[in-house]
């Protein structure tokens, strides 16, 4: 297993609809044809997997159908979008990148993106 640098933004604010997007960029030392990207959430010293995708260079990311994540790839950049976020989902979202094929296997883990989610205020009742 060889190390690889992964860069991601420090902070992202989710939209009022609970959608957050950020770029995960990796310094590929070789010409990988298969890449696996995993988003991890760290909160209260616990790490959980949010979603994972495998893709071929030049192809779309393959997330499971029930995933809250979508994404696109361009070169060594992955544009990730996480949907359905609520205030309780605020936390550090870490991008993990694995170059699966061809060998050697490379692994890179970013420093994380702090995603802040603010639940929208309910609309006040209106009198007409």
């Amino acid at each position: 297993c060889k190390a690889m640098h992964v860069a991601q933004p420090a902070v992202v604010l989710a939209s009022s609809r609970g959608i957050a997007s950020f770029v995960c960029e990796y310094a590929s030392p070789g010409k990988a044809t298969e890449v696996r990207v995993t988003v991890l959430r760290q909160a209260d010293s616990q790490v959980t997997e949010v979603c994972a995708a495998t893709y071929m260079m030049g192809n779309e990311l393959t997330f499971l159908d029930d995933s809250i994540c979508t994404g696109t790839s361009s070169g060594n950049q992955v544009n990730l979008t996480i949907q359905g976020l609520r205030a309780m989902d605020t936390g550090l979202y870490i991008c993990k990148v694995e170059l699966m094929y061809p060998p050697p296997y490379y692994l890179g883990i970013g420093n994380g993106t702090q995603i802040y989610v603010i639940d929208p205020e309910p609309c006040p009742d209106s009198d007409f």
């Epitope: 298969e34 495998t54 071929m56 192809n59 393959t62 159908d65 699966m100």
Partner: nanobody, 113 residues
Framework: EVQLLESGGGLVQPGGSLRLSCAAS????????MAWYRQAPGKEREVVAG????????NYGDSVKGRFTISRDNSKNTLYLQMNSLRAEDTAVYYC??????WGQGTLVTVSS
């Protein structure tokens, strides 16, 4: 048990065509990006073509663009590779791939007159 069973290889003359098939079983075929790789004698395995789960996105290695077409039928759990205008340098063992987990055993394609 996971199986990727390639078929359709054989001997063909330069300029000819072949259609490879890969029958998948033992896993959820429609959940995987699929690909064809090939390995010529004495060379590294290289990607030929890839296709997304739905079949809506495809990509090709530079050496086969415009000649090869990858497709899939999720209802039949089958991956295909239509190879046209074959050249001697296309001679190789062709492998079916469920990215990034499973490999087939390969089928030999020989292009020779």
């Amino acid at each position: 048990e996971v199986q990727l069973l390639e078929s359709g290889g054989g001997l063909v003359q330069p300029g000819g065509s072949l259609r490879l098939s890969c029958a998948a079983s033992g896993f959820t075929f429609s959940s995987y990006t699929m690909a064809w790789y090939r390995q010529a004698p004495g060379k590294e395995r290289e990607v030929v073509a890839g296709i997304s789960r739905s079949g809506g996105t495809t990509n090709y290695g530079d050496s086969v663009k415009g000649r090869f077409t990858i497709s899939r039928d999720n209802s039949k759990n089958t991956l295909y590779l239509q190879m046209n205008s074959l050249r001697a340098e296309d001679t190789a063992v062709y492998y079916c791939r469920a990215v990034s987990d499973y490999w087939g055993q390969g089928t030999l394609v020989t292009v020779s007159s």
